[in-house]
């Protein structure tokens, strides 16, 4: 298990001419939010899914208004991460969609509106535990400066987080820099180190001394931007120009553009303008709506009919989140008692009860009659660490909440007959016997054999 | 990794003394209840008695056999758990375990050692 | 003191089978009783801890239950590395005590 985060850096124009007009207006003052979707693997039909890996929703930016006559500057940004929270491997490369959405606060009748501004998607390779990785994407004038990084959520480990390194009862005496490890307790894991020099933005490692690199990037440290140059052979060392000898195939060529795209070559590779429903960078993703399934955990997703309209998932008890992605952490609230270990099952919370305690939240004290509480008027007797519950007339069990049956000791002798009555037992003596249990014989000549005063 | 190493234990006459050390690594000795449990040759386990840490007071509790012969002492300085064992008796013959009781079960149990009380 | 009576004393079973042992308290115990395997000329090894929780790295194969005075442990399919005696141990009140062990052995 691990957590996915996303850091949006700015949302604005991009460079060069048509620069966009600003979403908000002073007739129309707005807000921005982001949407993230994640979905696992670098293949086109993992990409078709829903976002399997989770998805996100940021908090409201910022009120924005135009000032008239001022180009669109960088918008206001909500403030914190994105966090998206993985249960399973983290799959080390993954596809990512990335909305931004303008929230309009004029006096629209039913509330605020949402619009879908921009859209970027990606697919990368990213390791968890490494270092932030930066991008841009552009999404038609619109430009998005992110970071973002996996990291594993404590047990877990690994460039997969597959690993678990729990302390079982106490801190561990694993050497500087190691940490122990569990369900291999009995060793000490080493934190990965990849290959010297290998580029902490590029590269990642899987195993220690390996350099494995992003996209767009290539050499044995992942130093070196993939080269976009369609030439296949330069001219020879006399040419003064730069060009190629033989036309080398095009970017577009063969058309990457996936679902009726179309292709363009730019300076640096090719850009693909997707039909209506379809984004990415070959428009291999297509708009997340009610019928991809996005809530998860049994989220009821209400609206969002077309790829430009939200849906809003309304998430079951015990989960929250824009996609009712994250499960409510209910050992936030320090439910167990007297340092006892809280797990959260997702069916229920169970404490894990420190030695001398007990109960489901650890509430009670095994050592002493304090926090054990006898019903019915019972008493609690203590002694040598020990404890117990005497109970009183007509009760038994550990707490005394049991009805006792209070013939089931046969307490009347001599083959008397108990009968059980709301106050505690009757007995009905045979013949020549007396007494509350018959326990006193009686004589012939009517005297009974009491002990003597 | 969690290691518990006892130590001590031998033959012994009836009547006679000996203690047993149990030498504790890889999890925080002080913050740990300990205990002693024995098992008696092709028998069955048997609890001794335990210690708690000192932020818990540091008590002791013994089972009836041994209460008043057997005494429990920790040394968390030196990560180490003993078990003083006086006016040994032919029926204490058995294996000693040293065990690590920080959550409501004999969660590490060391390897063990031989105590043989025989005339 | 709380007695522990573990059934039966031993058992055999074929690779594969489903394997049951019962442990009854005498006395209620809620679900305070722990479950260990101890294999031959070895330290016992903690199964299952407040009646039916799971160690951490403990196969699932091994499962517990019950609460009050009557438990069970069980292998759900019995394998040639479950050869051991398996004990149950309360912890409602001291002296904390365990029941007499059940052997298991392979046919």
């Known amino acids: 298990a691990g957590v996915f985060e996303l850091q949006i850096h700015s949302f604005g124009p991009g460079p060069g001419p048509g620069a966009p007009r600003s979403p908000c207006s002073a007739r129309l003052p707005c807000r921005l939010f982001f949407r993230v979707c994640l979905k696992p693997g670098l293949s086109e039909e993992a990409a078709e899914s829903p976002c399997a890996l989770g998805a996100a929703l940021s908090a409201r930016g910022p009120v924005y208004t135009e000032q008239p006559g001022a180009p669109a500057p960088d918008l206001p940004l909500p403030d914190g991460l994105l966090q998206v929270p993985f249960r399973d491997a983290w799959p080390g490369t993954f596809s990512f969609i990335i909305e931004t959405w303008r929230e309009e606060l004029g006096d629209q009748i039913g509330g605020p509106a949402w619009s879908l501004l921009a859209r970027v998607a990606g697919r990368r390779r990213l390791a968890a535990g490494g270092p932030w990785a930066r991008d841009i994407q552009r999404a038609g004038a619109w430009e998005l400066r992110f970071s973002y990084r996996a990291r594993c959520e404590p047990p877990a480990v690994g460039t997969a987080c597959t690993r678990l390194c729990r302390p079982r009862s106490a801190p561990s005496r694993c050497g500087p820099g190691l940490r122990p490890c569990a369900p291999l307790e009995d060793e000490c894991e080493a934190p990965l180190v990849c290959r010297a020099g290998c580029s902490p933005e590029h590269g990642f490692c899987e195993q220690p001394g390996e350099c494995r690199c992003l996209e767009g990037w290539t050499g044995p440290l992942c130093t070196v931007p993939v080269s976009t140059s369609s030439c296949l052979s330069p001219r020879g060392p006399s040419s003064a120009t730069t060009g190629c000898l033989v036309p080398g195939p095009g970017p577009c060529d063969g058309n990457p553009c996936a679902n009726g795209g179309s292709c363009s070559e730019t300076p640096r590779s090719f850009e693909c303008t997707c039909p209506r429903g379809f984004y990415g960078l070959r428009c291999e993703v297509s708009g997340v709506t009610c019928a991809d399934g996005p809530c998860f955990n049994g989220g009821l997703c209400v609206g969002g009919a077309d790829p430009d309209s939200a849906y809003i998932c309304h998430c079951p008890p015990g989960f929250q989140g824009s996609n009712c992605e994250k499960r409510v952490d209910r050992c936030s609230l320090q439910p167990c008692r007297n340092g006892g270990l809280c797990l959260d099952l997702g069916h229920a919370l169970r404490c894990r009860c420190r030695a001398g305690f007990a109960g489901p939240r650890c509430e009670h004290d095994l050592d002493d009659c304090a926090g054990r509480a006898c019903a019915n008027g019972g008493t609690c007797v203590e002694g040598g660490g020990a404890h117990r519950c005497s109970c009183a007339l007509g009760f038994g069990g550990r707490d005394c909440r049991e009805r006792a049956d209070p013939c089931a000791a046969r307490p009347c002798a001599h083959g008397g007959r108990c009968y059980a009555h709301f106050s505690g037992l009757v007995c009905a003596c045979a013949p020549g016997y007396m007494g509350a249990r018959c326990e006193f014989p009686v004589h012939p000549d009517g005297a009974s054999a009491l002990p003597a005063a | 990794e969690v290691q518990l190493v006892e130590s001590g234990g031998g033959l012994v006459k009836p009547g006679g003394s000996l203690r047993l050390s149990c030498a504790a690594s890889g999890f925080t000795f002080s913050n740990t209840w300990m205990s002693w449990v024995r098992q008696a040759p092709g028998k069955g386990l048997e609890w001794v008695g335990r210690?708690?840490?000192?932020?818990?007071?540091?008590?002791?509790d013994y089972a009836a056999p041994v209460k008043g012969r057997f005494t429990i002492s920790r040394d968390d300085s030196k990560n180490t758990l003993y078990l003083q064992m006086n006016s040994l008796k032919t029926e204490d013959t058995a294996v000693y375990y040293c065990?690590?009781?920080?959550?409501?079960?004999?969660?590490?149990w060391g390897q063990g050692t031989l105590v043989t009380v025989s005339s | 003191d709380i007695q522990m009576t573990q059934s039966p004393s031993s058992l055999s079973a074929s690779v594969g089978d489903r394997v049951t042992i019962t442990c009854q308290a005498s006395q209620d115990i809620s679900n305070y009783l722990n479950w260990y395997q101890q294999k031959p000329g070895k330290a016992p090894k903690l199964l299952i801890y407040d009646a039916s929780n799971l160690e951490t790295g403990v196969p699932s194969r091994f499962s517990g239950s019950g609460s009050g005075t009557d438990f069970t442990f069980t292998i759900s399919s019995l394998q040639p590395e479950d050869i051991a005696t398996y004990y149950c141990?309360?912890?409602?009140?001291?002296?904390?005590?365990f029941g007499g062990g059940t052997k298991v052995e392979i046919k």
């Open positions: 065990t690590q009781y920080y959550w409501n079960s004999f969660d590490y």
């Open positions: 210690i708690k840490s000192k932020s818990d007071g540091g008590t002791t």
């Open positions: 141990q309360q912890y409602d009140n001291l002296p904390l005590t």
